[in-house]
Interface confidence: low
């Protein structure tokens, strides 16, 4: 029953050029070149994927000529390496071209850069934007694809796909309507933080899978399938995982084309065996293929079948226990996770994995003791304290959330992540913190049953961004240590991080603490991160200081910009006011 | 964009046969994949047959050595060969079509097979 069984191909290029089309086939190519060389020109990689388009066509006509039968690694390496400023542009990176497949391609992946030296992308006018769009369709989409493409490396391919239509959607209505702006400026908002959240989970898909393999992605996919399609049977949770890891191995590795092309398979094949696998599909299923696919990888919970038996009678009660687990350790723990999820969408996936590996562990332990049974007995009852930590943490982290409002909350999370690990850069501390306190807008307005899938899983995402961030600079021990013993518990392991003691201060530095009059014209959430910049920089000048310390300053702070603002020479007054906050700043924290 | 419009509907005797023509136009040089698909009153929308560009073929069980696909790439157009018909094969029939899924969906063509 495999969706992915195809018969061979001379021409792969071919293949994949006649699968997806010419439109989808520049579009990938253009993705996946953008992904590894992150710092070349738009015209440049234009140039690129005419000339490889220009070849699959040929092998279109003609799947014996000359390379065609060349794999896709291959062919796109090759094209790759022609860029005539590798070397100046990408340094080592350029050392990768002297390599054969595949290590020619492991070594592209490994210069992936998940903070790329980049600028910011600026939003120009509407009306400029809407002549560009005009001007030329075509070029205006491709330059999206490529902007999100080469500031998101593992951006998850197709879904990128979705997004650009969605793109030119808003862009087709809004330059039509009355008050363009009115139109556009919501749509490009909702697109801008709906692609961070998908970059952010894929990039945990692709960790997952790069760093922990593929037996911690199925895992992963097991206990979550299990969750959304309840009454499937086992046997169809394990075939659309086994299709679903294909598909975002391919993607995370770099084989764009078979990704995509593998991912409308997976989507047909679901769409057409809907009856055993979800009740909640039909929607998703009358939907064009790129809408289908992303409405298929959010669906809703199915209902879970009525009168599920107790599952102590074949996992704890019978004898035969260790007997399954010897003939196939995998599946009989896939069956416990997949029987355990399926009752229990009120757990976050990295809750029901702890879950299943203390089951695993004490198996391991107890099927090789005197009496197995009697060992491995009360093995549920190891879950309640693993249940138990995650719930209490949201139900204090929520109260606290509810109390202070979100900008409050993040930066209680701030000065919480700075104490653990002030060795981290400040942009990364910022940005990791202002996303973990997200979570409370995100989850916390949901009911109990909702709360934990929605909190914690959502945590794993922020803190994988974290750890890729480190990975690149690596400063912090403790932060190396939590991201790669467990990938499950990750968080329990940032949460249980104490002050770090052995940290030594940072010295003061008043040009840390200087502002200008520009921070008037900021936007609301700019002038937030100016603010919460200072704090981070605060707490890691005096990683002591109390919360009633901290809390002074910052007020302090936030009534100097405010008064400042409102002056008719606001420089002066910046300049003026400034050192005095900084003076009673140094003071209040005792520098 | 492309257009699709079927062709070739009604009323039919159980054990008779009945083809479908679609014809496509617009963006077609995009289009991969073909297929039928058929809605009965009250049902959701079940898959019949599909074809790729390079002439590959399937079907559902329950179609299985009745139904054949076939297209004629020179005249765009796609057909659906339907024999030894049966009552629960009354349903409204389309057309659809797409680079990787079947994005474009014709208006269909009402197959009512009754004696």
């Known amino acids: 029953r495999g969706v992915f069984r195809r018969d061979a191909h001379k021409s792969e290029v071919a293949h994949r050029f006649k699968d997806l089309g010419e439109e989808n086939f520049k579009a990938l190519v253009l993705i996946a070149f953008a992904q590894y060389l992150q710092q070349c020109p738009f015209e440049d990689h234009v140039k690129l994927v005419n000339e490889v388009t220009e070849f699959a066509k040929t092998c279109v006509a003609d799947e014996s000529a000359e390379n065609c039968d060349k794999s896709l690694h291959t062919l796109f390496g090759d094209k790759l390496c022609t860029v005539a400023t590798l070397r100046e542009t990408y340094g080592e990176m350029a050392d990768c071209c002297a390599k054969q497949e595949p290590e020619r391609n492991e070594c592209f992946l490994q210069h992936k850069d998940d903070n790329p030296n980049l600028p910011r992308l600026v939003r120009p006018e509407v009306d400029v934007m809407c002549t560009a769009f005009h001007d030329n369709e075509e070029t205006f989409l491709k330059k999206y694809l490529y902007e999100i493409a080469r500031r998101h490396p593992y951006f998850y391919a197709p879904e990128l796909l979705f997004f650009a239509k969605r793109y030119k959607a808003a862009f087709t209505e809004c330059c039509q309507a009355a008050d363009k702006a009115a139109c556009l400026l919501p749509k490009l908002d909702e697109l801008r933080d709906e692609g961070k959240a998908s970059s952010a989970k894929q990039r945990l898909k692709c960790a997952s899978l790069q760093k922990f393999g593929e037996r911690a992605f199925k895992a992963w996919a097991v206990a979550r399938l299990s969750q959304r399609f309840p009454k499937a049977e086992f046997a169809e949770v394990s075939k659309l995982v086994t299709d679903l890891t294909k598909v975002h191995t391919e993607c995370c590795h770099g084989d764009l084309l078979e990704c995509a092309d593998d991912r409308a398979d997976l989507a047909k094949y679901i769409c057409e065996n809907q009856d055993s696998i979800s009740s909640k599909l039909k929607e998703c299923c009358e939907k064009p293929l790129l809408e289908k696919s992303h409405c298929i990888a959010e669906v809703e919970n199915d209902e879970m079948p009525a009168d599920l038996p107790s599952l102590a009678a074949d996992f704890v009660e019978s004898k035969d226990v260790c007997k399954n687990y010897a003939e196939a350790k995998d599946v009989f723990l896939g069956m416990f996770l997949y029987e355990y999820a399926r009752r229990h969408p009120d757990y976050s996936v990295v809750l029901l994995l702890r879950l299943a590996k203390t089951y695993e562990t004490t198996l391991e332990k107890c099927c090789a003791a005197a009496d197995p049974h009697e060992c491995y007995a009360k093995v549920f009852d190891e879950f309640k304290p693993l249940v138990e930590e995650p719930q209490n943490l949201i139900k204090q982290n929520c109260e606290l959330f509810e109390q202070l409002g979100e900008y409050k909350f993040q930066n209680a999370l701030l000065v919480r992540y700075t104490k653990k690990v002030p060795q981290v850069s400040t942009p990364t501390l910022v940005e990791v913190s202002r996303n973990l306190g997200k979570v409370g807008s995100k989850c916390c307005k949901h009911p109990e049953a909702k709360r934990m899938p929605c909190a914690e899983d959502y945590l794993s995402v922020v803190l994988n961004q974290l750890c890729v961030l480190h990975e690149k600079t690596p400063v912090s021990d403790r932060v190396t240590k939590c991201c790669t013993e467990s990938l499950v518990n990750r968080r329990p392991c940032f949460s249980a991080l104490e002050v770090d003691e052995t940290y030594v201060p940072k010295e003061f530095n008043a040009e840390t603490f200087t502002f200008h009059a520009d921070i008037c014209t900021l936007s609301e959430k700019e002038r937030q991160i100016k603010k919460q910049t200072a704090l981070v920089e605060l707490v890691k000048h005096k990683p002591k200081a109390t919360k009633e310390q901290l809390k002074a300053v910052m007020d302090d702070f936030a009534a100097f910009v405010e008064k400042c603002c409102k002056a008719d020479d606001k420089e002066t007054c910046f300049a003026e006011e400034g050192k005095k906050l900084v003076a009673a700043s140094q003071a209040a924290l005792g520098l | 964009q492309v257009q699709l419009v079927e062709s070739g509907g009604g009323l039919v005797q159980p054990g008779g046969s009945l083809r479908l023509s679609c014809a496509a136009s617009g963006s077609i040089e995009s289009i991969n994949r073909m297929a039928w698909y058929r809605q009965a009153p009250g049902q959701q929308r079940e898959f019949v047959a599909r074809i790729s560009k390079g002439g590959s073929t399937n079907y559902p069980d329950s179609v299985k050595g009745r139904f054949t696909i076939s297209r004629d790439n020179s005249k765009n157009t796609l057909y659906l060969q339907m024999n030894s018909l049966r009552a629960e094969d009354t349903a409204v029939y389309y057309c659809?079509?797409?680079?990787?899924?079947?994005?474009?969906w014709g208006q269909g063509t009402l197959v009512t097979v009754s004696s």
């Open positions: 659809a079509a797409g680079p990787v899924w079947e994005q474009f």
